[in-house]
């Protein structure tokens, strides 16, 4: 018995086609991914072949102004008309509250959604009882297949799932849910979840019973053969795992932000047993026509989007200085108002010892493309934020070595002078620079924000301790020369939209102020451009 | 909270008729398969009848099929089941069940069902 898997991760609000690098469509005929696009391939395959199953492995919510505007909305109803068969909660869901999910959501979808793991206490249990699943049976031809869900435990430090929420260890709360699903006889198993290709070869290894993972979180993107665009295999597709009882569980997950569709054929034998996997992602690239009904869709829900983007979100009462000439050279008003949002972005206080989990952010100046005058009646809306932020990017979450800090410091002003985008902007940091010192041995100071502390307090950087940092997904992946991020960071874990965060920022505080307060020094006797 | 929720159960003489109903609550039900399940007194859990919420294709188990009709009221968010010529052989517990949505269903399967109501007694006396 043949079962086809189609499969999404990581879309991220990315409902509309976009440019190959996953931001603005600019060239529609070099334009990839949509929903318009998606539903043509998937219509396709459904109507070429008998089982087929569209899953969607989480982070659907999260990632452009549809998002913003729509706060899950679009996400249910495009689901909807394309019919997914299944949808694992990723951590993103959980972005604006419970509320958040549980309304534009879990109550509008015709499918179901699931995770294992999340259980619910207090006044929360009854009310969302039912409206997510820890496994769903779904028919498909004669036969029944099981999916089981997950979610990244680290979710309540990534989202805001609120205190009546607990994220089990997967692998833990998995085994019993399998073994249900076997006792009803379903010997055809897919583990659906967010947690990323580590966690999911670990649930394809140590989860009895389970056939294939389905997975999300960490954008992998496996290929067999030669890769169709830009993006590197992290190995190949399906990823073969061998488990502790000596099964051979396929592993799949297709990068992000709906570029690709995950395309995996999987042959059982009559007692549920994988015989044979293959497949590959499919770029959804121009040579597969959008969809005209859901293109139609899509333009009649765009209208809304083009009337907020000058809505006022806030005002500023300072020019927000965002100009090169200052934000490639020192410490700039605009970078500090970044940093300052990307840090309440992140305020979890989920540790009694911790008044926050990070303190700190870093942001390449370059990544900074305008400024923002005060003299237009202190306005700032979306339209002023996506000239400052273009680039579509996320404020990620990482943990680094103090040693990588310091190297990512003394990277920043290792050809200082020269305009270039690295010089970098701060918040929960006080750098001092000595610029006449030689490159790779500028940084002379290097304090940062106490985390395990009830009063904030800046101590000398640690070498050899963990931080937690927040800074552009860019950064995290070794833009600007930041190599030493990419290499050795511990942990990455994929953030908010750039513009969505400062926007919430703005909105919140309703008038802002940002100064040049001292974040970015310079020894004094070296006279600075 | 998801709740299905059964009425119009109770003794009815062989030959007489009765209406179930489900009210469904808590979530959108539009794109679920909606079913009634009985279970007599010491038997397993049988399908009585089944459909889809939009476009309201119906199955019905066999033992039923020409007696029973199960129906939908998309405005009231209530699944009915309507039973003419009840024999003795009807008397038991009735379900109303759900699917949360997914692939189209129509069939009696009941792991496939997601929500299930608490039970409606029917009895049919000769």
């Known amino acids: 018995w043949e079962l086809t898997i189609l499969h999404t991760n990581d879309v991220h609000s990315r409902l509309e086609q976009t440019s190959e690098d996953s931001s603005k469509c600019v060239n529609a005929s070099r334009c990839m991914g949509g929903v318009a696009r998606l539903f043509t391939k998937v219509q396709q395959i459904r109507r070429a072949e008998p089982n087929v199953l569209l899953l969607d492995a989480g982070d659907q919510y999260q990632g452009t102004i549809w998002f913003t505007v729509y706060k899950g909305a679009e996400v249910a109803h495009f689901m909807n008309a394309l019919r997914y068969d299944a949808m694992a909660l990723g951590n993103h869901e959980f972005d604006n509250g419970v509320e958040g999910l549980i309304e534009p959501l879990l109550k509008e979808a015709k499918f179901p959604i699931l995770s294992a793991n999340i259980k619910a206490k207090g006044p929360l249990a009854s009310q969302i009882s039912g409206l997510y699943l820890p496994y769903k049976v779904l028919p498909v031809g004669d036969e029944v297949v099981g999916i089981v869900g997950y979610t990244s435990k680290e979710t309540p430090f990534l989202s805001n799932p609120g205190t009546n929420l607990v994220f089990e260890d997967e692998i833990t709360a998995l085994q019993p849910e399998v073994d249900k699903l076997k006792t009803l006889n379903v010997n055809k198993i897919i583990a659906l979840g967010h947690s990323g290709f580590e966690m999911d070869k670990l649930i394809a290894q140590k989860v009895r019973g389970v056939d294939v993972v389905v997975g999300g979180h960490s954008n992998t993107f496996l290929y067999t053969g030669n890769p169709p665009s830009k993006e590197v295999p992290a190995g190949k597709y399906p990823f073969i795992v061998t488990s502790d009882d000596g099964r051979k569980v396929p592993v799949v997950q297709a990068y992000a932000f709906g570029k690709y569709l995950g395309y995996l054929k999987i042959e059982f034998d009559e007692r549920g047993n994988v015989i044979s996997s293959h497949g590959n992602p499919i770029l959804l690239n121009s040579s597969i026509p959008e969809d005209p009904s859901i293109k139609a869709d899509i333009n009649k829900w765009r209208i809304k989007l083009d009337n907020y983007s000058t809505q006022e979100l806030g005002k500023t009462i300072v020019y927000l200085d965002g100009s090169s000439q200052s934000c490639r050279f020192r410490e700039c008003n605009m970078g500090n108002l970044i940093c300052d949002a990307m840090i309440n972005n992140n305020l979890r206080h989920t540790d009694e010892m911790f008044w926050n989990h990070v303190s700190m952010c870093i942001l390449n100046g370059g990544g900074i493309r305008s400024p923002i005058d005060e003299r237009n009646n202190g306005t700032i809306t979306w339209e002023n934020l996506a000239a400052v932020l273009p680039f579509g990017g996320t404020f990620d979450l990482v943990q680094l070595k103090g040693s990588t800090l310091k190297k990512a410091f003394e990277h920043s002003v290792h050809r200082y002078g020269q305009s270039t985008g690295e010089f970098l902007q701060v918040g929960g940091i006080h750098v001092v620079y000595d610029l006449s010192r030689k490159p790779g041995d500028r940084v002379v100071k290097l304090d940062v924000l106490c985390t395990k502390c009830r009063v904030p307090s800046y101590d000398p950087l640690k070498m050899d301790e963990v931080y937690k940092v927040i800074l552009p997904n860019f950064l995290a992946n070794g833009g600007d020369g930041f190599q030493m991020i990419k290499d050795e960071l511990l942990r990455h874990d994929s953030g908010d939209q750039d513009i969505n965060v400062v926007s919430t920022y703005i909105s919140k505080m309703k008038v802002i102020y940002p100064a040049v307060e001292g974040r970015i020094k310079f020894s004094h006797h070296h006279h600075h451009h | 909270q998801v709740q299905l929720v059964e009425s119009g159960g109770g003794l009815v003489q062989a030959g007489g008729s009765l209406r179930l109903s489900c009210a469904a609550s808590g979530r959108t039900f539009s794109g679920s398969t909606m079913g009634w399940f009985r279970q007599a007194p010491g038997k397993e859990r049988a399908f009585v009848a089944a459909?889809?919420?939009?476009?309201?294709?119906?199955k019905y188990g066999d033992s039923v099929k020409g007696r029973f009709t199960i129906s939908i009221d998309n405005a009231k968010n209530t699944l009915y089941l309507q039973m003419n010529s009840l024999k003795p052989e009807d008397t038991a517990v009735y379900y109303c069940a759900a699917t949360a949505g997914g692939p189209d269903y129509l069939g009696g399967r009941d792991i496939v069902y997601d929500y299930w109501g608490q039970g409606t007694q029917v009895t049919v006396s000769s």
């Open positions: 459909i889809r919420w939009i476009g309201g294709t119906a």
